[in-house]
């Protein structure tokens, strides 16, 4: 606590400026009135307060909005907003994206503080929803976020939000995030044509299930392995020769140099050999001829 | 910066069990998703498990039913206890956290499980 001492003979802040810096601590609480900073907060960022003269500024704001800030003077908060406690964000109400950039922005660069963490969850809770513009500015700032989620957490992300996505904001999901995506990818997408939609649902594949994988095959796409080798093995291994020949285009000759890693070498075991020979690229490990192949799973479902 | 240490790999029979161990340090705050991915001799890496901020887990194929992945936020620490073990689990076994802007990998763990 800053103790309430009268402001002296000529020091009363008529705005605030530059001259402030030179202010001891018991003088801008004495000199700065509450009102003044919270209409001129835009000019503090500018000016190079030290970190105790924050605290000083900050004490008058909570004095002012025992309640919370509200959001005209949140907007302009800049490095104050370092100063916040998780608590002092939780009586926030903020709604525009503007100032969840601006905050965002004080932060840029930097794993995320608990400060910007309780922010972006009041954000997005009080939205209900991620919608589109907000997850595009929190990507722009965070490319892992939607990796951050949990699937049951990404079910609830709207299709149209979908198209804030880039490739690399999905590069540290795991499959099961990707499950998710998918589908929500897929109906974003449907109304693009065939080379079109193949760009933009490239990044979502690893959730895509046979049938889908079958039906791009015979839509000339040429996958390129980075893209085949995320694939879901449950959903690579049904495909027949032909279609991963027909999905790869140009590409397939990179099976042999993928031939002992997942999922090329699970779908090589489930191939006859002839089949494989089709392809001459020298890959073994299919099942000889003449063997029966059972597919125990189907009779296990029938017993 | 976060360091990620892993323990608990070890030489096991087929159908004996194991426990991983990885423990954080360094500060990291939001949403946090710790997960296990594994690398057999001359494969490629592969995802095992996740467990995400909100505590619920997700599991690959092969493992699923005999992994199981926790954490103790007291302790900074995700676990992977790993039953019914099999050959084809002998691999190096890498914990990762991803947070919202970045992705951190621990060393490696190696696991071998004989026949």
């Known amino acids: 606590e800053v103790e309430k001492t009268a402001c002296p003979s000529g020091k009363k802040a008529r705005e605030i400026d530059e001259s402030l810096i030179f202010y001891k601590k018991w003088e801008l609480e004495a000199c700065v009135d509450a009102a003044l900073l919270a209409t001129q907060m835009d000019r503090v960022n500018a000016i190079p307060f030290t970190y105790e003269q924050l605290d000083v500024l900050k004490h008058k704001l909570d004095e002012l909005y025992p309640q919370g800030y509200p959001e005209s003077v949140i907007q302009h908060l800049g490095y104050l907003f370092l100063k916040m406690s998780p608590e002092d964000i939780r009586k926030w109400n903020v709604t525009s994206l503007e100032t969840l950039k601006a905050l965002l922005e004080v932060n840029k660069g930097h794993e995320m503080s608990p400060q910007v963490a309780t922010l972006i969850d009041r954000f997005v809770k009080g939205r209900g929803q991620l919608d589109k513009d907000t997850l595009d500015t929190l990507t722009a700032f965070y490319p892992g976020y939607l990796c951050s989620l949990s699937p049951e957490e990404l079910s609830s992300v709207p299709p149209s939000s979908i198209w804030a996505v880039r490739p690399q904001d999905l590069d540290t999901c795991d499959p099961r995030q990707l499950d998710v995506l998918y589908p929500k990818a897929r109906l974003a997408f449907q109304n693009m044509n065939g080379s079109e939609y193949f760009v933009k649902i490239q990044s979502f594949l690893g959730g895509a299930p046979t049938e889908d994988l079958k039906a791009l095959s015979q839509q000339n796409v040429s996958m390129d392995l980075a893209t085949f080798m995320k694939l879901r093995t449950d959903a690579v291994l049904p495909l027949t020769v032909a279609e991963v020949q027909k999905l790869l285009g140009p590409h397939v000759e990179g099976l042999k140099a993928e031939e002992r890693h997942r999922p090329v070498r699970d779908w090589i075991l489930r191939q006859r050999q002839d089949d494989l020979d089709t392809l001459g690229l020298g890959l073994q490990g299919g099942i000889p001829n003449g063997y029966l192949v059972l597919d125990l799973s189907m009779q296990e479902a029938l017993s | 910066q976060v360091q990620l240490v892993e323990s608990g790999g070890g030489l096991v029979q087929a159908g004996g069990s194991l426990r991983l161990s990885c423990a954080a340090s360094?500060?990291?705050?939001?949403?946090?998703?710790m997960r296990w991915y594994r690398q057999a001799q001359g494969k490629q890496r592969e995802w095992v498990a996740s467990?995400?901020?909100?505590?619920?887990?997700s599991y690959s194929d092969p493992v699923q039913g005999r992994f199981t992945i926790s954490r103790d936020n007291a302790r900074n620490t995700v676990y992977l206890q790993m039953n019914s073990l099999r050959p084809a689990d002998t691999a190096v076994y890498y914990c990762?956290?991803?947070?919202?802007?970045?992705?951190?990998w621990g060393q490696g763990t190696q696991v071998t499980v004989s026949s």
């Open positions: 990762n956290l991803g947070t919202a802007l970045s992705s951190y």
């Open positions: 360094g500060s990291t705050f939001g949403r946090i998703v």
């Open positions: 467990i995400y901020d909100s505590g619920s887990t």
